[in-house]
């Protein structure tokens, strides 16, 4: 089995995504996410569909899951705002918008992360970053520390194939390799950072890792523009 | 044992740019945060520039920022500062700094900075 | 942005004996505070870091404490090496602001 972090990637540079958000319930990390802006989280709906009765809260400025950083701080949720046509069936429309009880405390380990507005297709071939504290190989251990994986880009029509995600792959989504590196369960809602921008969201399907044949599916955010500056508004 | 040297200060016109380096040894150079910080002719230290271990994130305070860059160079072990558009309020002693425990651990002894006409 | 208010700025005692220099922060910094001792020529020496952690190699007469907003530091048995400006920082949030310093001359 693929061994190494995410799934065959490596620790990641200490507070050197700024925009790195933990999802947690109850104390403990559920999903990723990516800070937006000063009070919003970008994440995936399908994280908090089993939170109904636990405390959702946001890590912010975290390198170690447990260790004391000065510029780790959890937030409490005010509002969470999942997209209004996600459903617990399918992939499409995985986002969720997390509102914080309060504006971030910005900093070098505390920063937005700007995102993609133009709906346009990411080069097949383009190196893109994904981060996350998702589980590091197949027997499910999870990392402490921030892990990351530099994937390609996968052109749709291959990833639409019937022998990957046979037509599933939408306009509003997008693919990237998952050859031995991959995205990984514990990943989903992290972003897909390509040349400093915010293109993607880790879905949170359920989806066997670091197979090829079953590449990374990720949420366009450029696709989603309308919808995220209405909530934010 | 742990030594930081910095070099590049000078005086220097109003308006005028200036790159410092600091010169790193006796440990892993690559492993650390690294930070500037100056100490102004009232005494008064202040934090300037801040870079991770690898270069992926830098830090600037709004006093600096768009003014002053810090970089790295790990196969050379230094640290860098460009400053441009000098103003006579940026007359110091800057110093290069090491980060462990996020406090500011290992100081150089600094290099002065004059910003006259 | 948080700032420090560091008291008093100047300050003179005797061979042997104790001084204390206080930090106030603007609002809660977590107990992240560092005290450094500056003498002219050289950079600053980290002693303490997190509010009460002694560097190696410093030796025991020199302690911090404190929380939430107010922290102290102190030398005791004040030695004639011990003639530096004295400076606290406040690195929560890895946002680093420092007290205005303190001047320490032995009578």
């Known amino acids: 089995p693929p061994r190494g972090r995410i799934l065959g990637g490596r620790e990641a540079e200490a507070h050197a995504r700024p925009y790195m958000a933990s999802v947690q319930l109850n104390g403990a990390h559920l999903c990723g996410g990516v800070l937006v802006a000063e009070q919003w989280v970008l994440s995936a709906a399908h994280c908090l569909e089993d939170a109904a009765d636990g405390k959702v809260q946001v890590l912010l400025g975290a390198h170690s899951l447990s260790q004391p950083e000065p510029s780790k701080r959890l937030y409490d949720v005010l509002r969470a705002v999942p997209h209004p046509d996600s459903q617990p069936d399918t992939i499409d429309h995985d986002l969720l918008l997390l509102q914080l009880s309060e504006k971030a405390t910005l900093g070098p380990a505390v920063r937005p992360l700007p995102w993609q507005r133009v709906d346009r297709d990411v080069a097949p071939g383009t190196l893109c970053d994904v981060a996350g504290w998702g589980i590091v190989n197949h027997a499910g251990r999870r990392p402490d520390s921030l892990q990351h994986v530099l994937l390609p880009v996968l052109d749709r029509a291959t990833c639409n194939r019937r022998t990957h995600h046979d037509g599933a792959i939408t306009e509003r989504l997008m693919c990237a390799e998952s050859n031995r590196r991959d995205s990984c369960k514990g990943d989903s809602g992290g972003p897909l950072v390509c040349g400093g921008v915010l293109e993607g969201v880790v879905t949170s399907g359920s989806r066997v890792c670091g197979n090829r044949k079953k590449p990374g599916i990720y949420t366009r955010v450029a696709s989603y523009a309308a919808w995220i500056d209405s909530v934010l508004a | 044992e742990v030594k930081l040297v910095e070099s590049g200060g000078g005086l220097v016109q109003p308006g005028g740019s200036l790159k410092l380096s600091c010169a790193a040894s006796g440990f892993t150079f690559s492993n650390y945060i690294m930070s500037w910080v100056r100490q102004t002719p009232e005494k008064r230290l202040e934090w300037v520039a801040y870079?991770?271990?690898?270069?992926?994130?830098?830090y600037y305070p709004d006093t600096v920022k768009g003014q002053f860059t810090i970089s790295r160079d790990n196969a050379k072990n230094t640290l860098y500062l460009q400053m441009s558009s000098l103003k006579s309020e940026d007359t110091a002693i800057y110093y290069c700094a090491r980060h462990d425990f996020y406090a500011l651990d290992f100081w150089g002894q600094g290099t002065s900075v004059t910003v006259s006409s | 942005d948080i700032q420090m208010t560091q008291s008093p700025s100047s300050l003179s005692a005797s061979l042997g004996g104790k001084v204390t220099i206080t930090c106030k922060a603007s609002?809660?910094?977590?107990?992240?505070i560092a005290w450094y001792q500056h003498k002219p020529g050289k950079g600053p020496r980290l002693l303490i870091h997190y509010t009460s952690t002694l560097q190696p190699g410093i030796p025991s007469r020199f302690s911090g404490s404190g929380s939430g907003r107010d922290y102290s530091f102190s030398i005791s048995n004040l030695e004639p090496e011990d003639i530096a400006t004295y400076y606290c920082l406040k690195y929560d949030n890895l946002l680093y602001t420092f007290g205005g310093g303190t001047k320490l001359e032995i009578k």
């Open positions: 870079i991770t271990n690898g270069g992926g994130a830098t």
């Open positions: 609002q809660d910094i977590n107990k992240y």
